[in-house]
């Protein structure tokens, strides 16, 4: 079972993930981003449910498409290259979701834009941070 120190580490990782996702959202929502209209045409798979750490499997599976879309954006909107940013997120996600490799993601029927996708995972991080004990 998780200890108080491991739970604290989990909280910090979630806060880091939240900041990374918010940074991406702010970067693509930047009014100077000329590629936003094009980026919004890309569709992302949304989790059927996202309330627990194991549901991060669904985010992990969409990180490659996310990186591809971010490559369209002007790099000056982000402090890091998309590859490095996604790599950082991937490391956190892998640690958070644990090694339960048999857990398969189930997706919602409808796809979403990059903005809806990021907002969903931002909400997820915020809710876990506020309820994890």
């Amino acid at each position: 079972a998780p200890t108080s120190s491991s739970t604290k580490k989990t909280q910090l990782q979630l806060e880091h993930l939240l900041l990374d996702l918010q940074m991406i959202l702010n970067g693509i929502n930047n009014y100077k981003n000329p590629k936003l209209t094009r980026m919004l045409t890309f569709k992302f798979y949304m989790p059927k449910k996202a309330t627990e750490l194991k549901h991060l499997q669904c985010l992990e599976e969409e990180l490659k498409p996310l990186e591809e879309v971010l490559n369209l954006a002007q790099s000056k909107n982000f402090h890091l290259r998309p590859r490095d940013l996604i790599s950082n997120i991937n490391v956190i996600v892998l640690e958070l979701k644990g090694s339960e490799t048999t857990f398969m993601c189930e997706y919602a029927d409808e796809t979403a834009t990059i903005v809806e996708f990021l907002n969903r995972w931002i909400t997820f991080c915020q809710s876990i941070i506020s309820t994890l004990t």
């Epitope: 739970t7 989990t10 059927k48 449910k49 309330t51 627990e52 919602a108």
Partner: antibody, heavy 117, light 107 residues
Framework: DVRLVESGGGLVKPGGSLKLSCAAY????????LAWVRQTPEKRLEWVAA???????YSPDTVRGRFTISRDNAKNTLYLQMSSLKSEDTAMYYC???????????WGQGTSVIVSS | DIVMTQSQKFMSTSVGDRVSVTCKAS??????VGWYQQKPGQSPKALIY???FRYSGVPDRFTGSGSGTDFSLTISNVKSEDLAEYFC?????????FGGGTKLEIK
């Protein structure tokens, strides 16, 4: 057949403690998230705590620091340790199974907790 | 926290009628909504998940619909055994929250 059987409820004084148990049957206990949901005397349903298959625990502000959810996968049993009880904790406490991708699919019969002096 | 509102506390209907119980979420919850039936003296029983899918064994006269913020549970050809209280619940995010319930009375 999935069954959840709660026990441990009773009458307790404000500030007191109580430990609820829930014995689970008919499914792979260790693979599921389990949760406690309570129903107040006014029939309002409130989510109290959840514990996932990795034993991470989740709870709302109203009970954080007072209630602790835990599980024993070897005994197929879920627990809720309640302390610093208040009159507003008076309720029927239900043990529920949280399906991985959907709603709370199975509920126990409930155990009653009354906090009164 | 997401607030789930069931504006009608009581609904009266007759055997054979069709009745709809509604539920409104304070923010978008996609289709992460479940419906539960609680008969007098019993614990809640899951009827619907993902807003519109019936659990195994639930009669097909129970139909869930909606997405986003507005949801409904429709009971067609109401039977006397449908006398119960019905609750909606969002599982879009923790903390899970429930509607206040709608009690169905049979005339």
């Amino acid at each position: 057949d999935v069954r959840l059987v709660e026990s441990g409820g009773g009458l307790v004084k404000p500030g007191g403690s109580l430990k609820l148990s829930c014995a689970a049957y008919g499914f792979t206990f260790s693979s599921y998230t389990l949760a406690w949901v309570r129903q107040t005397p006014e029939k309002r349903l409130e989510w109290v705590a959840a514990i996932d298959s990795s034993s991470y625990t989740y709870s709302p502000d109203t009970v954080r620091g007072r209630f602790t959810i835990s599980r024993d996968n070897a005994k197929n049993t879920l627990y809720l340790q309640m302390s610093s009880l208040k009159s507003e904790d008076t309720a029927m406490y239900y043990c529920t199974r949280d399906s991985n991708w959907d709603a709370l699919d199975y509920w126990g019969q409930g155990t009653s907790v009354i906090v009164s002096s | 926290d997401i607030v789930m509102t069931q504006s009608q506390k009581f609904m009266s209907t007759s055997v054979g009628d069709r009745v709809s119980v509604t539920c409104k979420a304070s923010q978008n919850v996609g289709t992460n909504v479940g419906w539960y039936q609680q008969k007098p003296g019993q614990s809640p029983k899951a009827l619907i998940y993902s807003a519109s899918f019936r659990y195994s064994g639930v009669p097909d006269r129970f139909t869930g619909s909606g997405s986003g913020t507005d949801f409904s549970l429709t009971i067609s050809n109401v039977k006397s055994e449908d006398l119960a209280e019905y609750f909606c619940q969002q599982y879009y995010t923790y903390p899970y929250t429930f509607g206040g319930g709608t009690k169905l009375e049979i005339k």
